[in-house]
Amino acid sequence: SERCDDWGLDTMRQIQVFEDEPARIKCPLFEHFLKFNYSTAHSAGLTLIWYWTRQDRDLEEPINFRLPENRISKEKDVLWFRPTLLNDTGNYTCMLRNTTYCSKVAFPLEVVQKDSCFNSPMKLPVHKLYIEYGIQRITCPNVDGYFPSSVKPTITWYMGCYKIQNFNNVIPEGMNLSFLIALISNNGNYTCVVTYPENGRTFHLTRTLTVKVVGSPGGGSGKPIPNPLLGLDSTGLNDIFEAQKIEWHEHHHHHH
């Protein structure tokens, strides 16, 4: 076949997605390699083609877009999984071409499993909060484009294993989680589970990020209070100590 500008395997874009959840993956060509967008390319008569190489295989093969319930589909420059399966892991290639032009790039996609406390091999984004600095928020990341604005999803927030309820200084507010006053005890992993309907089915998105409470921007900081139970009222404490004697940082038991 005619020559194709091959940008190789873009390992900077190591994409990790959770098993059994939707995933939308934009072709990196338009994000990082080409100076024009998909609409321009499409208008110019260029076609975007997707194919993949399974994990531990060398053979490039076309992506099957005829799976039941359109499990894998392409929409403009986005490859959709509704939902992913573990064996979707592999290297994916998007190629833009017509009779006179060709450009392609590959990127790795890893489908990962999570445990009962949302721990997984997923690399987590880190969000810094300033200690005792007034109200600060984190937002459930990377959920844009999964559902239209007319759809109102439900969002449930967790800290580690625990559903966030009865926490004195941490308030779930839809896609946002507000920290009324950030304390050292608020360090940890926070997970949002977003639930939304689509075409007669219900999908879930799980997103975890790490919160690090750091010194205030002016340099001075209040005294840290290294009490991992701070931020829970007595109801929360009762929940935690009910039934089994567990410890806040023990991630194996899922109590709430």
Epitope: D115, F118, H256
Partner: antibody, heavy 118, light 107 residues
Framework: QVQLQQSGPELVKSGASVRISCKAS????????MNWVKQRPGKGLEWIGR????????NYNGKFKDKATLTADKSSSTAFMQLSSLTSEDSAVYFC???????????WGQGTTLTVSS | NIVMTQTPKFLPVAAEDRVIITCKAS??????VAWYQQKPGQSPKLLMY???NRYTGVPDRFTGSGSGTDFTFTISSVQVEDLAVYFC?????????FGAGTKLELK
Amino acid sequence: QVQLQQSGPELVKSGASVRISCKASGYAFSGSWMNWVKQRPGKGLEWIGRIYPGDGNTNYNGKFKDKATLTADKSSSTAFMQLSSLTSEDSAVYFCARDYYLFYFDYWGQGTTLTVSS
Amino acid sequence: NIVMTQTPKFLPVAAEDRVIITCKASQDVSNEVAWYQQKPGQSPKLLMYYASNRYTGVPDRFTGSGSGTDFTFTISSVQVEDLAVYFCQQHYSSPLTFGAGTKLELK
């Protein structure tokens, strides 16, 4: 599509044990919680507990902690509930039901009827 | 344990009636209440979650509302196929608990 297929009806003697199974298909078995719910005529629904097959983690309703033991086999996508020291109070329909971390149940098995005879 | 008190236990209805079932939690459960429908010899089916969110495929004649301790489930115009038992459930905290059920029967 998601399906939870439970084992058939059981007739067992008082004092014995029984193991009920629930075979899942149509979703990633390891990545959702599997719950067990008891239903007796006129007694409504009672949550027994749940298991996360991915790591074997369990939560129990304190009332059933000494009665039920939950396990799961990832290779066959099957969840199990063992009930021990059976009495007539354990005669009921038992359902398995899936939840995705959110504590409500989007898919249910068809139910397994347990009859304990003296 | 959170107790879910559901009323009424029995509800005689005629086709196209408006039906209201209530559920009262013994403590604040935010908006974390689900509603299920169970027909004779069948397993329960999820209708609503987070009090007011209709599960996929559930007709829009079914609605739910409420937060804190008081919750309402409404069928705007009952159809014959809606004759069943309806249960509320709090999905706020462990142990998860259900209401005793409301049986819809023909007048």
